[in-house]
């Protein structure tokens, strides 16, 4: 099943997020991803957990998953590099770098997103954009077109309350509000963008969606700058 959803969001402006990628398994959307370099897409490590026997590809330049669009192109994956410390049973280090079979053809609808290198927290209350092709309601409806939602960042202390994520949110993770509007499993690997810069990647741990006491969890890319740079080098 696809890992994720944008709950309570709205349809994104077509091709206004040219960094947005759909990580696909056997031709179907599995996870979100974000183009961070001409030949590299950043996603979540857990996305490929069940993909051992399938064909993983990356769709770039898409708004609709099904309709023909001039900018759309499906790339094979040359190499999949999960973070070495990622594990199936934790949300920590949930990052994956996918090397495309060739450099992406860049244009207005396909362009890498600058990512945050300064290792500091996003200030609570800052509004950040998260986008994806995940399920849009609790009935499980999957959208054909890219959805997005603007969410306020939540402070770590609140997110770590016993009633919320009970201490699971390390300094390498961040949270955003989840009151009826949320990212969720199937949006895993997708980007959390604050002020036009990639700050977080949707984690793919299982959690209830759209419940304000279970905020969305995102991996802070700045905390992994050294690893990203070493893989991209």
């Amino acid at each position: 099943p696809p890992r994720g959803r944008i709950l309570g969001g709205r349809e994104a402006e077509a091709h206004a997020r040219p960094y947005m990628a759909s990580v696909q398994l056997n031709g179907a959307h599995l996870c979100g991803g974000v183009l961070v370099a001409e030949q590299w897409v950043l996603s979540a490590a857990h996305c490929l957990e069940d993909a051992a026997d399938g064909k993983v590809q990356v769709l770039l330049g898409a708004h609709s998953l099904s309709q023909p669009e001039p900018s759309k192109r499906l790339y094979d994956v040359l190499r999949a590099v999960p973070h070495p410390d990622s594990q199936p049973d934790t949300i920590d280090h949930d990052l994956l770098l996918l090397q495309l079979s060739e450099k992406a053809t860049l244009g207005p609808a396909v362009r890498p997103l600058p990512w945050q290198r300064v290792d500091r927290d996003v200030a609570p209350g800052t509004l950040c954009d998260v986008a994806g092709w995940g399920i849009v309601n609790h009935a499980g409806r999957r959208p054909d077109s890219l959805q997005h939602v603007l969410l306020p960042v939540l402070d770590r202390a609140t997110c770590n309350r016993r009633t919320h994520h009970d201490g699971a949110i390390t300094e390498r993770l961040m949270c955003a509000e989840s009151n009826r509007r949320d990212s969720c499993k199937g949006d895993s690997g997708g980007p959390l963008v604050c002020g036009g810069v990639l700050e977080g990647v949707v984690t793919s741990g299982s959690r209830v969606c759209g419940n304000r006491k279970k905020p969305g969890i995102y991996t802070r890319v700045a905390s992994y700058a050294a690893w990203i740079d070493s893989v991209l080098a």
Epitope: A16, H148, L150, E177, G195, V197
Partner: antibody
């Protein structure tokens, strides 16, 4: 076109409360944050807080917690701000304003015309 | 809370001149800043968002720049309709505070 139409001027007594409204039209009301901003006569602007009509989520400036309460009525596409325990310090023009989307960015792009609140005995 | 210090507080200029208004944040706000113009008795109007992006319908003589804690709004070849008050506002964490304003007056 996007419009935010605010209620008319209010003259209220110290200690009383007042509820001002902001009726939205020309866009999907539940999809956009509504901010409230205070401007004292001849002074600058102060951010009071925002509400997201789709969920009712609110964020307040600590300074206005207990003073301002933000609500919405989705059926009429109207945002409200209740100001309580009014003093002369609350005499000001209050603006509602929408946060709009620009690709993955956002900005407070449309403003109401303002509602003047005068607190006087 | 992040403080926004705007300067100058007032500026007396002539039509055709170029002016620069600055806004300094008490800490890094990572370009999460907007500029507004407000005429007497009117609502503020968005000019620039995320430090450098010109809002729809804003003349190209306006431009925003800056990063970190220092931001500027530049108006080239000032027109008569540009006189009024200008405010910056940050969006890096709540509360989204405004600068104290700059009053642009005709000399």
């Amino acid at each position: 076109q996007v419009q935010l139409q605010q209620s008319g001027p209010e003259l209220v007594k110290p200690g009383a409360s007042v509820k001002i409204s902001c009726k939205a039209s020309g866009y999907s009301f539940t999809d956009y944050y509504i901010n409230w901003v205070k401007q004292r006569p001849g002074q600058g602007l102060e951010w009071i807080g925002w509400i997201f009509p789709g969920s009712g989520s609110t964020y307040y400036n600590e300074k206005f917690k207990g003073k301002a309460t933000l609500t919405v009525d989705k059926s009429s596409s109207t945002a409200y701000m209740l100001l309580s325990s009014l003093t002369s310090e609350d005499s000001a023009v209050y603006f509602c304003a929408r946060t709009g989307y620009y690709s993955n960015l956002y900005a407070v792009d449309y403003w109401g015309q303002g509602t003047s609140v005068t607190v006087s005995s | 809370d992040i403080q926004m210090t705007q300067s100058p507080a007032s500026l007396s200029v002539s039509v055709g001149e170029t002016v620069t208004i600055t806004c300094r944040a008490s800490e890094n706000i990572y370009s999460n800043l907007a500029w507004y113009q407000q005429k007497q008795g009117k609502s503020p109007q968005l000019l620039v968002y995320v430090a450098t992006n010109l809002a729809d319908g804003v003349p190209s003589r306006f431009s925003g720049s800056g990063s970190g804690t220092q931001y500027s709004l530049k108006i080239n070849s000032l027109q008569s309709e540009d006189f009024g008050n200008y405010y910056c506002q940050h969006f890096w964490g709540t509360p989204y505070t405004f600068g104290g304003g700059t009053k642009l007056e005709m000399r």
